[in-house]
Amino acid sequence: IIDGAPCARGSHPWQVALLSGNQLHCGGVLVNERWVLTAAHCKMNEYTVHLGSDTLGDRRAQRIKASKSFRHPGYSTQTHVNDLMLVKLNSQARLSSMVKKVRLPSRCEPPGTTCTVSGWGTTTSPDVTFPSDLMCVDVKLISPQDCTKVYKDLLENSMLCAGIPDSKKNACNGDSGGPLVCRGTLQGLVSWGTFPCGQPNDPGVYTQVCKFTKWINDTMKKHR
């Protein structure tokens, strides 16, 4: 997260980290006791999922292995459309004050809405600085028309843009798959942006979760 600050402790109990061994790979969100939602470009063969602590490496955190993941069938490695994936935990997460399910959206929030993006990704770019504590930054949803002015034909229908004019506030590497939460519901998953991260007036691009609630529910049901 660029130009952010540590999240208020325990304010993101649905935030998870996907680790490769002990190394941060991506962010994600807990949908229920068995399922994590993240970005399709975060796909690996096996995951270690960190839950229940804002601090990576915290011994009190839950660590659960996951071996099965289901990319959206329409994901494209070229255009990055439909950049979302469900990861099935090998054992159930224990819900607590620090481990909660995210609220999936019942509607798409409009441009101008203030949202929070969070993650353990690098806080500097192109030189990298990985924080141990979960970082947050507030950004505003940007209309597709305004975002298309920046990204032209790179922007697809189910992509959502967010940023602050003339500001560096943005996601970065390591934040992928993590949540963009607006008015208490999950509206986006960190998908992509320009490099170096945090270039003013280059919005962050997110998978627009409100367009995929049916796929999310259907996939979890299908692979129960």
Partner: antibody, heavy 127, light 108 residues
Framework: QLQLQESGPGLVKPSETLSLTCTVS??????????WGWIRQPPGKGLEWIGS???????YYNPSLKSRVTISVDTSKNQFSLKLSSVTAADTAVYYC???????????????????WGQGTTVTVSS | DIQMTQSPSSLSASVGDRVTITCRAS??????LNWYQQKPGKAPKLLIY???SLQSGVPSRFSGSGSGTDFTLTISSLQPEDFATYYC??????????FGGGTKVEIK
Amino acid sequence: QLQLQESGPGLVKPSETLSLTCTVSGGSISSSDYYWGWIRQPPGKGLEWIGSIYYSGSTYYNPSLKSRVTISVDTSKNQFSLKLSSVTAADTAVYYCARGRPLGYGARHYYYGMDVWGQGTTVTVSS
Amino acid sequence: DIQMTQSPSSLSASVGDRVTITCRASQSISSYLNWYQQKPGKAPKLLIYSASSLQSGVPSRFSGSGSGTDFTLTISSLQPEDFATYYCQQSPPFPPLTFGGGTKVEIK
């Protein structure tokens, strides 16, 4: 400003291993979000990508050379190296090291362009 | 592997001419295409990345366009220092990263 400098023997015998080192100055390999790669150019021909290594240590190789190639990083010396085994005359080329600049973060991070190059070193394979 | 085909392989032009070089990918690569300039005895130099973004320090007479499989590098008004060989390059994520065969721009 970042500079890259290739070094290594200019003459290698057939069947031996070609070893080259790229020294990076003006920036750190270990803490910079870039790829570091090797490209070669046989005399009078085009460019061929050999492979790249990400700052975290992940390696990516050209499938046509994969069985013979090893790329590694020595962060203490701010260097990355190429080893190409079982060389033949077809491996005679100018070898370049280069920095790969990602085209974006997240899903666009796996794509890159080589924005800083060494000046190249000529390697001849001959007995 | 994705094949990159450049055309023409060589061309002759005069100072001030508008020059267009094309690059075709054997399958869609979205906008993940870069262009390089190489002068004899020198290392290549990145001109354009992501099909149309001008690399810092490169003169604005160079421009790139295209997406999917067909891409173009245009030099709006050829200058004496532009006589060189130009290569297109497809980015990964899946190796190999591949270059086109090159286009040599010569003085007419």
